[in-house]
């Protein structure tokens, strides 16, 4: 009889432990849900406020017409520069017109002076053709002025008001470009 009572007591204790564990799991789950809810609300709040303030370009980016530009404060090789831009939802600068080139060089003069800045232009190793990163050809007036005598891959950069070429593995500042947000008014 005593053995039977003892067995029942042990079973009850085991049940109690399981219930405590379930309660603990539930509390943990509830806490996790609350945290996720908090994160969701913060994200929604952020999205709403940024939509409300709806500036066409992010902070520290410069706007010109439909584009936003970011002038880097760090040096990197061409390929890393491209990846740095992609992190920001942008690509290296692609200059489509003389007007855009003038805007960029004018802005650089104000910001930093005469440094080298990678743009999204590279030379095909086989054909020697210059192509923008999206595969399009630059307009004739926007071809790098000097042909780099490098056996390595050659990429384009802006300096002062010129488009020049250099070994892609050299370190330079870079300029990213993304589309400006259109206001939905």
């Amino acid at each position: 009889k005593l053995l039977q009572v003892s067995t029942i007591a042990m079973q009850q204790q085991e049940k109690l432990i399981q219930q405590e564990r379930a309660l603990l799991n539930f509390t943990e789950w509830k806490r996790s849900c609350a945290l996720q809810m908090k994160y969701c609300q913060a994200f929604m709040q952020n999205s709403l406020s940024s939509a409300h303030n709806s500036s066409p370009c992010p902070n520290n980016w410069i706007q010109n017409r439909e584009s936003c530009y970011y002038v880097s404060e760090i040096w990197s090789i061409w390929h890393t520069s491209q990846e740095n831009c992609l992190k920001e939802g942008s690509t290296l600068l692609q200059i489509e017109s003389k007007e855009e080139m003038d805007f960029i060089t004018g802005s650089l003069r104000k910001i930093k002076g005469s440094y080298d800045y990678w743009v999204g232009l590279s030379q095909d190793g086989h054909s020697g053709r210059w192509l923008w990163q999206d595969g399009s050809s630059p307009s004739p007036g926007l071809l790098p002025a000097e042909r780099s005598q490098s056996a390595n891959q050659v990429c384009g950069y802006v300096k002062s008001n010129s488009l020049l070429s250099s070994n892609c593995s050299t370190w330079k500042y870079f300029i990213c470009e993304k589309y400006a947000l259109r206001s939905s008014v």
Epitope: L86, G89, S90
Partner: nanobody, 116 residues
Framework: QVQLQESGGGLVQTGGSLRLSCAAS????????MGWYRQAPGKQRELVAA???????AYADSAKGRFTISKESARNTVHLQMSSLKPEDTAVYYC??????????WGQGTQVTVSS
Amino acid sequence: QVQLQESGGGLVQTGGSLRLSCAASGSIFNINSMGWYRQAPGKQRELVAAITVGGRLAYADSAKGRFTISKESARNTVHLQMSSLKPEDTAVYYCTIWAADYQQYWGQGTQVTVSS
């Protein structure tokens, strides 16, 4: 946790085509860019093509004119259409996402083999 699932890899003859797809699932709130890298045996991983949230494109020189990247934003999916394939395109192709929290997520990779 974010998962990236690649598909579409395989064995193809020189001059052939393949379409790689990558579907992202999990807690992704904002994607800045999506893209494809590849790694051939004994070589470094290199960017093949990428597309930003706004639709701007970036291709490696080796991909220009032969590969096309596209995305389906609603489904968090990115595709890489590869044509005129060459033996030197043989590699493991990895899908990647640059998220708004500055995290970069990677898929497990899909093997592409181009036989001559």
